[in-house]
């Protein structure tokens, strides 16, 4: 039985040209995390495999950095980066857990005055 839950940063906003940390945390399970996939809609951004390490998709190599931890840092944000992001935790023996984050990339002035939650 899958008892774990994924906590995420939820809905976040960031400035165009800036960077943001996408973070998920798996709790309430003793299952072993074997791999975490980060996806944007249907596009694979990165994989962190417990045995092999990080793989960053070639098309995102210049703008994506691993960490902190199992999280992902997106850099040089553009308005096109707005959308849903998913952290997919592959665990043993539980199976797969998925978390969702919605990122909105805003023009600088809008982001500065917006009331949305922002990762420092």
């Amino acid at each position: 039985m899958m008892t774990g839950t994924i906590e995420t940063t939820g809905n976040i906003s960031a400035e165009k040209g800036g960077s943001i940390i996408l973070q998920c945390h798996l709790s309430s399970t003793t299952a072993q995390v074997t791999q975490v996939n980060w996806e944007q809609q249907d596009q694979l951004l990165a994989i962190c495999n417990a045995d092999l390490g990080w793989h960053i998709s070639p098309s995102f190599k210049d703008r994506v950095a691993p960490g902190p931890g199992l999280g992902l840092t997106l850099q040089s944000l553009t308005v096109n980066d707005t959308g849903e992001y998913f952290c997919i935790y592959h665990t043993y023996p539980d199976g797969t857990y998925t978390g969702r984050i919605f990122l909105e990339v805003l023009e600088s002035s809008v982001a500065e005055h917006g009331a949305r939650f922002q990762i420092p």
Partner: antibody, heavy 119, light 107 residues
């Protein structure tokens, strides 16, 4: 005794194929990721490929991507490296190796099998 | 890919000397760094993993330190059996990569 024994090396012409095998004993093979590392004569070490315990994730060096395929058969305690479209620069001693659990440091190595690509 | 730059490429030392080898990564690799010793005609031997953890059976005169991009392997008092080539290896990013090696020779 924990042991890895490679086989399948030899002299092969450029463009041809070769399949290396690595027989494991003395540990629970199916619990570990496994790797291939090579060393050209008189040169340093080069990581070639790695595969997770269940073959769910695989990685390759850029120099072999698209030409080499790593695989394993846990029932036979064996690791394989299928090498296609071989080039002179693939000439090397090929080692298979197992990692320390959760560390990614390679603590057990075979004796190596020599692959020579030449016409 | 991550480049690992080892220095020096070779070092001449005497028995009893303290020897320090450095390994610099082109990007941060946390603590996912290992050190190996290789003697001619032999397979590499793991000395240090996780940047600073001593592999079982390895003498305590070997030690590793560092995180991020800068790492060090230290042999506190060189012994005759320590004359060999030493390699660092990162396992944070795929593909894994090795440094170019440091040859420790007898002075």
């Amino acid at each position: 005794e924990v042991q890895l024994v490679e086989s399948g090396g030899g002299l092969v012409q450029p463009g041809r194929s070769l399949r290396l095998s690595c027989a494991a004993s003395g540990f629970t093979f199916g619990d570990y990721a496994m790797h291939w590392v090579r060393q050209a004569p008189g040169k340093g070490l080069e990581w070639v490929s790695g595969i997770t315990w269940n073959s769910g994730s695989i990685g390759y060096a850029d120099s072999v991507k698209g030409r080499f395929t790593i695989s394993r058969d846990n029932a036979k305690n064996s690791l394989y490296l299928q090498m296609n479209s071989l080039r002179a620069e693939d000439t090397a001693l090929y080692y298979c190796a197992k990692p320390v659990p959760k560390s990614r440091g390679l603590d057990v190595w075979g004796q190596g099998t020599m692959v020579t690509v030449s016409s | 890919d991550i480049q690992l730059t080892q220095s020096p490429s070779s070092v001449s030392a005497s028995v009893g000397d303290r020897v320090t080898i450095t390994c610099r990564a082109s990007q941060g690799i946390s603590s996912w760094l290992a050190w190996y010793q290789q003697k001619p005609g032999k397979a590499p031997k793991l000395l240090i993993y996780g940047a600073s953890s001593l592999q079982s059976g390895v003498p305590s005169r070997f030690s590793g330190s560092g995180s991020g991009t800068d790492f060090t392997l230290t042999i506190s008092s060189l012994q005759p059996e320590d004359f060999a080539t030493y390699y660092c290896q990162q396992a944070f990013y795929l593909p894994w990569t090795f440094g170019g090696g440091t040859k420790v020779e007898i002075k």
